[in-house]
Interface confidence: low
């Protein structure tokens, strides 16, 4: 079935909707579930066979200003002996999120939604072998 | 909120943070990047901690479709292709921001919502609890 895009819906528009200028939408950036916490297993970035590090990126004209990115530590994966096994590959797992970008044009300020690709962690995969003819 | 450097030539404004409500352009930057993880890579099948992807749909949200990962096994796949329960497959979770229609069903009025998604799985050494 049809998936509604932002600005479109297959619901009837209720009477209570706020008036919005054409070509834009009203966005409340008071976040729902702001205090929710990730309950991931402890230290998985160090315990993983494809371990990773975290880097915090900061941009004052982005909301949220802090975005955490992961980077795989190795090309290969860590085997049972704690050594890197390059017959396997550590690869990044990525997820899209939305941010609000503030743009300055002279003294006026505008806001733009932006999709950002976040590297969340790494996983160990069997490599794709390309056979040369 | 976050602080921004002020342009000294602009009228003085005490609010250096993002306002609570903003009007944003309907066009989302980078909107057309590939959002179906099943198509974007086959890591979910090739991983030693493979996962399935379940479609979560909510027309009151943008994006309306989010793919959730669920680890296939409690253990990890070893070199023989068997499940090794001495290791654990665990989900990698991430908080992401989505848009929630507010008030409900309104076409052009949204609120940011933080949701927790499982993006994939990774193989970890288990935490062993030694009983005293």
């Amino acid at each position: 079935r049809k998936i509604p895009k932002v600005g479109h819906t297959f619901f009837q528009k209720p009477e209570s909707c706020p008036p919005v200028p054409g070509g834009s939408m009203k966005l409340d950036i008071g976040i729902i579930n702001e205090n929710q916490r990730v309950s991931m297993s402890r230290n998985i970035e160090s315990r993983s066979t494809s371990p990773w590090n975290y880097t915090v990126t900061w941009d004052p004209n982005r909301y949220p200003s802090e975005v955490v990115q992961a980077q795989c530590r190795n090309l290969g994966c860590i085997n049972a002996q704690g050594k890197e096994d390059i017959s396997m590959n550590s690869v990044p797992i990525q997820q899209e999120t939305l941010v609000v970008r503030r743009k300055h044009q002279g003294c006026s300020v505008s806001f733009q939604l932006e999709k950002v690709l976040v590297t969340v962690g790494c996983t160990c995969v069997t490599p794709v072998i390309h056979h040369v003819q | 909120g976050i602080t921004i450097p002020r342009n000294p030539g602009c009228p003085n404004s005490e609010d250096k943070n993002f306002p609570r409500t903003v009007m944003v352009n309907l066009n989302i930057h980078n909107r057309n990047t590939n959002t179906n993880p099943k198509r974007s890579s086959d890591y979910y099948n090739r991983s030693t901690s493979p996962w399935n992807l379940h479609r979560n749909e909510d027309p009151e949200r943008y994006p309306s479709v989010i793919w959730e990962a669920k680890c296939r096994h409690l253990g990890c796949i070893n070199a023989d292709g068997n499940v090794d329960y001495h290791m654990n497959s665990v989900p990698i979770q991430q908080e992401i921001l989505v848009l929630r229609r507010e008030p409900p069903h309104c076409p052009n009025s949204f609120r940011l919502e933080k949701i927790l998604v499982s993006v994939g799985c990774t193989c970890v050494t288990p935490i062993v609890h030694h009983v005293a």
Epitope: - | H54, E68, K70, R72, H73, G75, N82, V83, D84, L116
Partner: antibody
Framework: QVQLQQSGAELVRPGASVKLSCKAS????????MHWVKQTPVHGLEWIGV????????AYNQKFRDKATLTADKSSTTAYMELSSLTSEDSAVYYC????????????WGQGTTLTVSS | SIVMTQTPKFLLVSAGDRVTITCKAS??????VAWFQHKPGQSPKLLIN???NRYTGVPDRFTGSGYGTDFTFTISTVQSEDLAIYFC?????????FGGGTTLEIK
């Protein structure tokens, strides 16, 4: 069609051990995990653990780690659960359940085995 | 472990009634929730998986919804053969856990 046939009711003495069986048919036994669950009026349904018949790998709920031992015999397509050092707390109905490993959910349950521990 | 709190424990309804059962998880389980029907003298049967996906062959009067921590199971028009115990189960995290069950009785 998929069937999980469990062994009959057991009446055993405290301190003894018992081995319950779950005979699988209608599918490739070694391709699917087999899980075991305990049901009592007080605690309801409790997950005990899982065995992967293909490689014998097991995982247990911490609560049952010293109580249950899961095994599987591929030749007879039968999963077993041995319960040791039995007490009245072990009196329950025990179910084996097939887990669709790829899809990630339980689909077929055995009919259950009633275990009564009494002197 | 994740606690699944199921309500109500008992339901006494007439044929044709609409029935709603809820399950609340102690932490987010995404959509990894299943609903089962357990009729007297039979094995439990899977009705709903992934919170809202009706399992093969299950009549469309049975529906499920929810995501995260709050889940709902509905029988739109109860029939006499629906007399059973219904329970939810999460397989988001090990140890997998179950709701306490709802006994549905038909007047």
């Amino acid at each position: 069609q998929v069937q999980l046939q469990q062994s009959g009711a057991e009446l055993v003495r405290p301190g003894a051990s018992v081995k319950l069986s779950c005979k699988a048919s209608g599918y490739t036994f070694s391709d699917y995990e087999m899980h075991w669950v305990k049901q009592t009026p007080v605690h309801g349904l409790e997950w005990i653990g899982v065995i992967h018949p293909g490689n014998g790998g097991t995982a247990y709920n911490q609560k049952f780690r010293d109580k249950a031992t899961l095994t599987a015999d591929k030749s007879s397509t039968t999963a077993y659960m041995e319960l040791s050092s039995l007490t009245s707390e072990d009196s329950a109905v025990y179910y084996c359940i097939r887990f669709l490993t790829y899809e990630g959910y339980f689909d077929y349950w055995g009919q259950g085995t009633t275990l009564t521990v009494s002197s | 472990s994740i606690v699944m709190t199921q309500t109500p424990k008992f339901l006494l309804v007439s044929a044709g009634d609409r029935v709603t059962i809820t399950c609340k998880a102690s932490q987010s389980v995404n959509n990894d929730v299943a609903w089962f029907q357990h009729k007297p003298g039979q094995s439990p049967k899977l009705l709903i998986n992934y919170a809202s996906n009706r399992y093969t062959g299950v009549p469309d009067r049975f529906t499920g919804s929810g995501y995260g921590t709050d889940f709902t199971f509905t029988i739109s028009t109860v029939q006499s053969e629906d007399l059973a115990i219904y329970f939810c189960q999460q397989d988001y995290g090990s140890p997998y856990t179950f709701g306490g069950g709802t006994t549905l009785e038909i007047k």
